[in-house]
């Protein structure tokens, strides 16, 4: 459809309404009149012969939608010291603040900005940071599954795989890595200790769950911390 020519004010025919996206019905004038575009407000309402008169929002005020507001809305107050301004206050949009690194938003505004930031929770030894976040954006901790461990208290570290030994000295558990025995001179043909690459911490969309001591399926936690041992069958 070609671009429409604005022809407000006009009288809607019986049974019809004004075009709600950019027009409103003025009861006094009984006409469909133009709304004001984002960044403006109504200075004078329409009458039968003249259309709405719009004016720009003043500093620190905005309108984000086509509107028939008598005043613009006030922008939110400046971002706090633990926040970063990700969208400035303009005539057409409100200021948006986000939490700085290491913090999550504990209290959001209806416009998506953050009102209160909190320090991210830390996961202790035996627990790693889950790939998903809590609904509020805080870290979720999950018990390290068999074959993985975490020996730190951190808001970023994930459970890492135990190292794989040719000869195992001490099995790993949820909070400590496996310890490999030194190579025996008689078994020089056996490959050196193998280390499994450690994945980087990952972040994904929050799941509908709250932080708890364990977020792993019960079938895994019931297996205990039996290490995965790769023994060599090569001999002399």
């Amino acid at each position: 459809v070609p671009a429409q020519v604005v022809l407000t004010p006009y009288k809607p025919e019986p049974g019809y309404e004004c075009q709600i996206s950019q027009e409103y019905y003025d009861r006094k004038a009984q006409m469909c009149c133009a709304k004001c575009p984002p960044g403006q407000y109504v200075k004078h309402f329409c009458n039968k012969t003249s259309d709405t008169v719009c004016a720009d929002c003043e500093a620190s005020m905005y309108t984000q939608v086509w509107n028939q507001f008598r005043t613009c809305l006030s922008c939110s107050s400046s971002c706090t010291t633990d926040q970063v301004e990700i969208r400035a206050c303009t005539k057409q949009q409100n200021r948006v603040c986000a939490c700085e690194a290491g913090r999550y938003c504990a209290l959001k505004t209806h416009s998506g900005s953050c009102r209160q930031c909190m320090r991210l929770s830390k996961c202790g030894p035996g627990f790693g940071v889950a790939s998903s976040r809590a609904p509020n954006g805080n870290v979720l901790c999950k018990a390290c599954a068999p074959g993985t461990f975490s020996d730190t208290t951190s808001s970023t570290d994930v459970c890492r795989p135990h190292r794989i030994c040719s000869i195992l000295a001490i099995p790993g558990n949820a909070s400590t890595d496996a310890v490999c025995a030194p190579e025996s001179p008689t078994l020089s043909a056996i490959p050196r200790t193998l280390y499994v690459s450690q994945p980087e911490p990952t972040r994904s969309q929050p799941l509908d769950q709250e932080p708890g001591p364990s977020q792993t399926p019960s079938i895994l936690t019931s297996l205990g911390s039996t290490p995965i041992i790769e023994q060599s069958t090569k001999g002399g």
Partner: antibody, heavy 120, light 112 residues
Framework: EVQLLESGGGLVQPGGSLRLSCAAS????????MSWVRQAPGKGLEWVST????????WYADSVKGRFTISRDNSKNTLYLQMNSLRAEDTAVYYC?????????????WGQGTLVTVSS | QSVLTQPPSASGTPGQRVTISCTGS?????????VHWYQQLPGTAPKLLIY???NRPSGVPDRFSGSKSGTSASLAISGLRSEDEADYYC???????????FGGGTKLTVLG
Amino acid sequence: EVQLLESGGGLVQPGGSLRLSCAASGFTFSSYAMSWVRQAPGKGLEWVSTIIGSGANTWYADSVKGRFTISRDNSKNTLYLQMNSLRAEDTAVYYCARHEGYYYYGMDVWGQGTLVTVSS
Amino acid sequence: QSVLTQPPSASGTPGQRVTISCTGSSSNIGAGYVVHWYQQLPGTAPKLLIYGNSNRPSGVPDRFSGSKSGTSASLAISGLRSEDEADYYCAAWDDSLNGRVFGGGTKLTVLG
């Protein structure tokens, strides 16, 4: 393709009745207001009646008020005009037309028309 | 007599600009209702040419334009062509009659 097809016209005696139908296709019929417009031989267009999409509101020209009834069956995508107590001056080609639904309601789709002749 | 008054005829030569007027009253055009224009080529059904005073449906050449002021409206056709030879009707809602009204129609002739 958006289409309107009128039927039901013909020769009828003064005082008689006739029911015109308009079959709609190619669009969501219930979302649009519909009208009947007529044109007497060699004359201009004359609006007859309008009905909104739901069928709840109707309007009639003074010349047909009390004699003609506009109706619609949205399940059948069909518009009707029941014409009673017909007069010689009702002789015309009758068009059904769709009102475009959003931009100021001009009649953007028309049928080819059906001729109604009222004569003894 | 029609509620909306149009000149019965208008004419022009190819390439010329022709204007057709449509005069109403305070109960229709003057009340603020929009005006639509229809073109009816010989032996065919009418076709929406201009809606909402000045908007062209897709497919209508930009040679056709509409405007409205006070109680009257007008249709302008520039660069007149032989295929523009047709009857032209204006239409609007009328408060007094509580219904739609058409102008009497203007027969446009494209000369020689």
